[in-house]
């Protein structure tokens, strides 16, 4: 009896795992084995596919074959007993195009009101994604174990922290990878669950801000309790995308180790030009808080985002405000090479009622003022980039009296 060729061959590629599945064409024939050949583009000869010779089942793994994943490959299969079936040719395919991204590895660290998620590719040093390893982004689904109401978080990197959670509560999550450059969405990881801890008696420091004074950075934060010590750590922001990098390590700012005040001062030359993350932790000697929320700190913007300098021309019913470049120490103007928005606050000297104007222009009119009245003005600058949402401190208030009536022209 002639053996029939196997049919419906499926090629599944997940990361560097190459799996073939097929259907037996004749279930009634026993002791049949199956063998595959492969052919590379531009070759005439067929080569035996190692790992897929004389297979008794309907599945085989040819992951050990070192293929160029960007090169087209053709496969053929036949059944064998005493005789052999004819070859059945599988449509040619390019491994990279066919490959799916496997489930990532996930490691969770619990805080009382946050979870830190560390994500890494499921296949370490993958050949398939060798050129794309740093392009992975991840998305996750998280839910309270008790409720099951899911929240989706898209476009996160290899390390992500979810805040505003409840203490002593079990949260579950699953993560998948994506390669947006290749329009590939991966397979979800297994579900990982972790219980947040009891509430820490010491809350993390809050409202961290960086400002510039002379040649120093001044880092300030708020804290609930007195008689604490604090430490500050920094990390290159770009490393958040790549914790596999051996440079991925939070480092101490030497002048901010074990400080006893809610601020620390360190020289600007501690940081080269770049974008950094900063975090602060509090300790009372016995207990330690969890880390604060991380703030993004851009040396370029931080160094130069000084409060604006302005002149006021007073009229009877309005002020004309002319905003100039802020002055550095040494009275030299700072060149701002990124767009800014100006926030101008003004109030009647005898009142606390503040009014606000937001303007992109550097000449601003403050209208509807009363004649012969003292008004005070202060201003600050904001960057227009949402990702680097930075603000200068407010300038010192300048107070001016409006002119008598009929001088508005």
């Amino acid at each position: 009896k002639n053996l029939k060729s196997p049919q419906k061959v499926e090629v599944d590629i997940i990361d560097d795992n190459f799996i073939l599945r097929w259907n037996r064409s004749d279930e009634s024939v026993g002791n049949v084995t199956f063998s595959f050949d492969y052919q590379k583009t531009g070759m005439d000869n067929w080569i035996k596919l190692s790992g897929c010779q004389n297979i008794t089942s309907t599945k085989c793994n040819f992951s050990s074959l070192k293929l160029n994943v960007y090169e087209e490959i053709k496969l053929r299969i036949r059944a064998e007993k005493e005789n052999t079936s004819s070859w059945y040719e599988v449509d040619s395919f390019t491994p990279f195009r066919k490959a799916q991204i496997g489930p990532p590895e996930v490691h969770l660290e619990a805080e009382d009101k946050a979870i830190v998620i560390h994500i890494s590719p499921g296949t370490k040093d993958s050949v398939m994604w060798a050129l794309d390893g740093l392009s992975f982004t991840y998305s996750l689904v998280i839910w309270k174990n008790s409720s099951g109401v899911e929240e989706r978080i898209e476009n996160i990197y290899s390390r992500h922290k979810i805040y505003k959670l409840s203490p002593e509560t079990t949260y579950c999550l699953k993560v998948k990878a994506a390669l947006l450059t290749s329009w590939k969405i991966g397979v979800y990881s297994p579900v990982h669950c972790i219980k947040t801890t009891v509430e820490n008696e010491l809350p993390p420091p809050e409202n961290i801000e960086v400002s510039v004074q002379n040649q120093n950075y001044v880092l300030k934060w708020d804290y609930t309790y007195a008689n604490m010590t604090f430490q500050v750590q920094w990390l290159h922001a770009f490393l958040k995308r790549n914790p596999g990098n051996h440079l991925y390590k939070w480092k101490q700012i030497p002048d901010c180790e074990n400080v006893k005040t809610t601020q620390c001062v360190f020289p600007q030359n501690v940081f080269q030009k770049g974008i950094y993350l900063l975090r602060v932790q509090a300790s009372d000697g016995n207990n330690t808080s969890f880390w604060s929320e991380e703030i993004k700190f851009d040396t370029e913007i931080q160094a130069f985002l000084l409060p604006p300098v302005f002149n006021i021309r007073s009229l009877s019913d309005s002020f004309h405000i002319y905003i100039g470049a802020p002055k550095q120490s040494g009275n030299t103007p700072v060149i701002q090479d990124y767009p800014l928005i100006y926030e101008i606050i003004f109030w009647e000297n005898t009142s606390n009622a503040e009014r606000k104007i937001i303007e992109k222009k550097t000449d601003v009119t403050v209208p509807n003022l009363k004649p012969l009245t003292v008004y005070c003005v202060k201003a600050r600058a904001h960057t227009m980039d949402e990702k680097l949402n930075k603000s200068s401190v407010f300038s010192d208030a300048v107070c001016e009296k409006t002119k008598p009536g009929n001088t508005s022209k």
Epitope: V116, R159, K249, N287, W291
Partner: antibody, heavy 123, light 107 residues
């Protein structure tokens, strides 16, 4: 698979120093903290300190700070623990043990241990 | 330093028994607790980390629970190979500290 292989047993006189090695394999050596833990005969476990193999940052148990030195040879994926000014109560088995990833926000458990090195201090 | 107090210090039980070992810390350690098993002449082996997570390859009869300052290791049905000494360890604050150990013996 992850393996930590330690150097052989040592007999030392009081006042001398001992240097124990721990060779790591099966993982990215510079991505994990390496810890040292000791156990005196019939006693419990005592943490001595840890080192980051990527930049040699160290943290110590205050009890050992003045006598212990941790070093790294990245070319051979080996960590060394040197204990000086030995006394009889330093007789113990010394273990190296892999800690958490350096990229973690917080410390982690010790998931792989060396086989231990017996150091005997006797005059 | 954070003190870790284990109880009992020794325990006799039979194969098939359910066994519980407790560990108390002098400060809150926020689930940064590991349990290790050590057999004579061997290195400790990690069983549980993060107070409740089972290390890969460890049989499911081992489980961890607890939070704050109070933690428990449970062996649901003792097997002959489980007779050993068990240690808890906190890794919330340096120096990391261990409990004094619980020796589990055959009754």
């Amino acid at each position: 698979q992850v393996q930590l292989v330690q150097s052989g047993a040592e007999v030392k006189k009081p006042g001398a120093s001992v240097k124990v090695s721990c060779k790591a394999s099966g993982y990215t050596f510079t991505s994990y903290w390496m810890n040292w833990v000791r156990q005196a005969p019939g006693q419990g476990l005592e943490w001595m300190g840890k080192i980051d193999p990527s930049d040699s940052e160290t943290h110590f148990n205050q009890k050992f700070r003045d006598r212990v030195t941790l070093t790294v040879d990245k070319s051979t994926s080996t960590v060394y623990m040197e204990l000086s000014s030995l006394r009889s109560e330093d007789t113990a088995v010394y273990y190296c043990a892999r800690g958490g990833r350096i990229s973690f926000d917080y410390d982690a458990a010790l998931d792989y241990w060396g086989q231990g090195t017996l150091v005997t201090v006797s005059s | 330093d954070i003190q870790m107090t284990q109880s009992p210090s020794s325990l006799s039980a039979s194969v098939g028994d359910r066994v519980t070992i407790t560990c108390k810390s002098s400060e809150v350690i926020y689930n940064r607790l590991a349990w290790y098993q050590q057999k004579p002449g061997k290195a400790p082996k990690l069983l549980i980390y993060g107070a409740t997570s089972l290390e890969t390859g460890v049989p499911s009869r081992f489980s961890g629970s607890g939070s704050g300052k109070d933690y428990t290791l449970t062996i649901s049905s003792l097997q002959p190979e489980d007779f050993a000494t068990y240690y808890c360890q906190q890794y919330w604050n340096k120096p990391f500290t261990f409990g004094q150990g619980t020796k589990l013996e055959i009754k």
